[in-house]
């Protein structure tokens, strides 16, 4: 029951990390006009990753795409290429998680490889969180530097316009929704990782040694120790199992109140 | 067709309350902002203040203790207060509609205001 | 508060000819973010309302005439009347749309000569 919570909530915790991550991509306030130094502008200023946008306080908001690749920033292009990895990792590592659930059966998928995609998937949900982070804090790392340039010649770190007037710009609303979204896609690949673990059965079933003696069954393994006594008429053939650590969900595969683990 | 009418006393007393009403029609008082500007007999244009779509204001820096904006969504009518009145705050009061650029787009008439005992 | 200046305070021009005036701001109309100057001129004939003419500095209002044309950037602009008609006497006032207070020059009062 564990691991399929534990699964269940990283796959919805990824879940709404990524669709963050998305909409975080698409937004256009990744950095805002700085109004410290002119509180009292009619003309309001804000740029993402992909247009610049200028609201006027009439109510007028006109935005401008960048039409072109050469001429941005070399740091532009980088936290674009981020996001997108980001994205597409996210999306992928989605895909694999909703077949890898615990709670969905599809076909007769053993356990061993739910729990190969479950690693798969949250393996993606952590470099998909970690490519939102690094990307998000790159831009907000390339505002700080611009913010604090004093020549007026300088990049507003997006369309690579000069500017005659010094604008600066402060950390936008996109920058909190990567930075919290990436977090959160993060902390549901550890915690895909983490039900990994209790869905993979281990490798290291010991062979047992059978000894018959009449009337009842009584086997042992190498080391001596007494594992299983068997008494009634079924004790033909008594496999003894040991899985090593098991969970409440993997209990329910064996039934047989004769089986110990 | 986009309209606006100022009205309001012609005649206010020294140190009262001077109060104008801008009456407006053919667009939306949420989209726009409405701009009251003054121009004193024989001289040139005043600008006193602004309120937004959003119901923000901007005033004059000179004026700001005296005059409020204000807008009544429900009966289309944007309103100017402006307390303690002199004799230099006589003046042609027009109010006018912020588009495009924050340019003033569309004006009303105006109102002669006098302020005399 | 931004100072707007303009000059000269009043122009006589032949009917047909050219009319130019002029208006500079203490400080840079120009928005970085869109590279728009926020300078609006308006045109005012005795006893009506002012009437919009030039946003943007350049951009004309639907309805004016062509004849009519800003130019400039940053605190230097410029209102040109290509051909002066006899219509086209009135005081015209630029505007700073950029930054509160939205100040006004003092106005430019064009004549027939």
């Known amino acids: 029951m564990a691991v399929t919570a534990c699964q269940g909530l990283g796959f919805v915790v990824s879940l709404i990390g990524i669709a963050g991550i998305i909409a975080a991509t698409c937004m256009d306030q990744w950095s805002t006009q700085d109004l410290y130094n002119n509180p009292v502008t009619a003309v309001f200023n804000y740029q993402g990753l992909w247009r610049s946008c200028v609201r006027e306080s009439s109510g007028f908001t006109e935005c401008r795409g960048y039409f072109t690749l050469l001429g941005l920033p070399a740091m532009l292009q980088a936290v674009r290429a981020l996001m997108i990895v980001g994205i597409v990792l996210g999306a992928i590592g989605l895909l694999v998680s909703i077949f890898a659930l615990k709670c969905i059966r599809i076909g007769s998928m053993e356990d061993s490889a739910k729990a190969n995609m479950t690693l798969t998937s949250g393996i993606m949900f952590i470099v998909s969180g970690l490519c939102a982070i690094a990307g998000v804090s790159v831009f907000a790392n390339m505002l700080v530097t611009n913010f604090w340039m004093s020549t007026a010649n300088m990049y507003t770190g997006m369309g690579g316009m000069v500017q005659t007037v010094q604008t600066r710009y402060t950390f936008g609303a996109a920058l909190f929704v990567g930075w919290v979204a990436g977090g959160l896609t993060l902390i549901g690949g550890v915690m895909m990782c983490i039900a990994c673990r209790g869905l993979a059965p281990e490798e290291t079933n010991y062979k047992a040694v059978s000894y018959h003696a009449s009337g009842h069954s009584v086997a042992y393994k190498p080391g001596g120790f007494k594992a299983s006594t068997g008494f009634g008429s079924n004790t033909k053939n008594k496999k003894i199992y040991d899985g090593g650590a098991r969970t409440e969900d993997e209990v329910q595969s064996y039934p047989s109140k004769h089986d110990y683990v | 067709q986009v309209q606006l009418q100022e009205s309001g006393p012609g005649l206010v007393k020294p140190s009262e309350t001077l109060s104008l009403t801008c009456t407006v029609s053919?667009?939306?008082?949420?989209?726009?902002?409405v701009s009251w500007i003054r121009q004193p007999p024989g001289k040139g244009l005043e600008w006193i203040g602004v309120i937004w779509g959003d119901g923000s204001t901007n005033y004059h820096s000179t004026l700001i203790s005296r005059v409020t904006i204000s807008v009544d969504t429900s009966k289309n009518q944007f309103s100017l207060k402006l307390s303690s009145v002199t004799a230099a705050d006589t003046a042609v009061y027009y109010c006018a509609r912020a588009g495009r650029g924050n340019a003033l787009d569309y004006w009303g008439q105006g109102t002669l205001v006098t302020v005399s005992s | 508060d931004i100072v707007m200046t303009q000059s000269p305070d009043s122009l006589a021009v032949s009917l047909g000819e050219r009319a130019t005036m002029s208006c500079k701001s203490s400080q840079s109309l120009l928005n970085s973010g869109n590279q728009k100057n926020y300078l609006t001129w308006y045109q005012q004939k005795p006893g009506q309302p002012p009437k919009l003419l030039i946003y943007w500095a350049s951009t004309r209002e639907s309805g004016v005439p062509d004849r009519f044309s800003g130019s400039g950037s940053g605190t230097d602009f410029t209102l040109t009347i290509s051909s002066l008609q006899a219509e086209d006497v009135a005081v015209y006032y630029c505007q700073n749309d950029y930054s509160f207070p939205l100040t006004f020059g003092g106005g430019t009062k064009l004549e027939i000569k």
């Open positions: 053919g667009f939306s008082l949420t989209s726009y902002g």
